[in-house]
């Protein structure tokens, strides 16, 4: 009888442990729809605009924006500006991240540009000094762009 | 316009080794990707990889590893097919082609492999 | 490896015909998918890119639709100059695999 009261005090007394754990963490990450939510509410047209920027130069195909309005370093720190509205959470960004590839993904043309815009991508944050994504998946739209 | 042109047709013992060039003009040759597809007498168009001309990275189709090397010069606009070890089965026409808005293909290049 | 099949193989039609072809992959790849049309002795030539876009100088009466795994591409009024062979080619990034192309011969 003891040892069952034992065995039961144990086993709350992991769960307690575990479930704090698990709160720790999830504040630390940055609780999943709050991320969503924030994502929503900041304009991520400057990251975006930013990010094709250096891909496209000053390529003529790329005219969904007049990209060659504003210059490159005003549009990275205008994106910087927009994500320091989030909470800086390696889950917020990564979210924030995937919301940019899902957005220009059909402004993308080919496999190449898919390639060097995630790269530019997954440079974003170190480059407002952000905490960056350890994994951020970025094949979006089914897995294909 | 965008314009691929690719080398004269080549006729190889087995065994010999060939490469082949596909020249770009009309636009910057860094910014899209560069594929290579093969279509042996009579069949369909085979793909067999991909280069990315900003890195120079090669991507290839199963089937297309070891023999077969895919490489650039930047400086003349031109990308290259090198196939060693020539076997029958590689007479072919060789393809360049461009991916993305304006996508085109070059003229062709053929391959024969005969003793 | 992503596999692409295409049908009908052969499509006997008219000239003013409405023509479909069908192009389905074996999983999701977006709107990655092209096509091209070449006739016997030439290169092939792009027609669509990005399931949709038609290609410059490309008659407006070719259309591309679908997204996912399912493909079409529709010509309304079939011309004397649009019988060839016809292939549908996913372009994703790791792969490029062409469906094995459909014929389309005279009636």
């Known amino acids: 009888m003891a040892k069952s009261t034992i065995l039961v005090a144990l086993l709350a007394l992991v769960l307690v442990a575990h479930a704090s754990a698990m709160r720790r963490e999830r504040g630390r990450q940055g609780d999943s729809s709050s991320c969503e939510r924030q994502v929503d509410r900041v304009n991520l047209k400057p990251c975006e605009q930013h990010i094709m920027q250096r891909i496209m130069g000053e390529q003529e195909q790329y005219d969904s924006y007049d990209i060659r309005s504003t210059r490159s370093s005003d549009q990275q720190q205008r994106c910087c500006d927009e994500l320091n509205e989030m909470e800086n959470t390696q889950r917020c960004m990564c979210e924030a991240l995937q919301q940019i590839m899902e957005n220009q993904c059909d402004r993308l043309q080919d496999r190449q540009m898919v390639q060097q815009f995630k790269r530019e991508l997954m440079n974003l944050p170190q480059q407002c000094n952000f905490r960056a994504p350890q994994r951020c998946d970025l094949d979006v739209s089914g897995g294909r762009c | 316009q965008v314009q691929l042109v690719q080398s004269e047709s080549e006729l190889k013992k087995p065994g010999a080794s060939v490469k082949i060039s596909c020249k770009a003009s009309g636009y910057d040759l860094t910014k899209y990707a560069m594929n290579w597809v093969r279509q042996a007498p009579g069949q369909g168009l085979e793909w067999m990889g991909w280069i990315n001309t900003n890195t120079a990275k090669p991507t290839y189709a199963q089937g297309f590893t070891g023999r077969f090397v895919f490489s650039l010069d930047t400086s003349v606009r031109t990308i290259y097919l090198e196939i060693s070890n020539l076997k029958a089965e590689d007479t072919a026409i060789y393809y360049c082609?461009?991916?993305?808005?304006?996508?085109?293909w070059g003229q062709g290049t053929l391959v024969t492999v005969s003793s | 490896d992503i596999q692409m099949t295409q049908s009908p193989s052969t499509l006997s039609a008219s000239v003013g015909d409405r023509v479909t072809i069908t192009c389905r992959a074996s999983?999701?790849?977006?709107?990655?998918l092209a096509w091209h049309q070449q006739k016997p002795g030439k290169a092939p030539k792009v027609l669509i890119t990005k399931a949709s876009n038609l290609e410059s100088g490309v008659p407006s009466r070719f259309t591309g639709s679908g997204s996912g795994t399912d493909f079409t591409l529709t010509i309304t009024s079939l011309q004397p100059d649009d019988f060839a062979t016809y292939y549908c080619q996913q372009y994703t990034t790791y792969s490029g695999t062409f469906g094995q192309g459909t014929r389309v011969e005279i009636k």
């Open positions: 082609s461009r991916d993305g808005s304006g996508a085109s």
């Open positions: 999983q999701n790849i977006g709107r990655w």
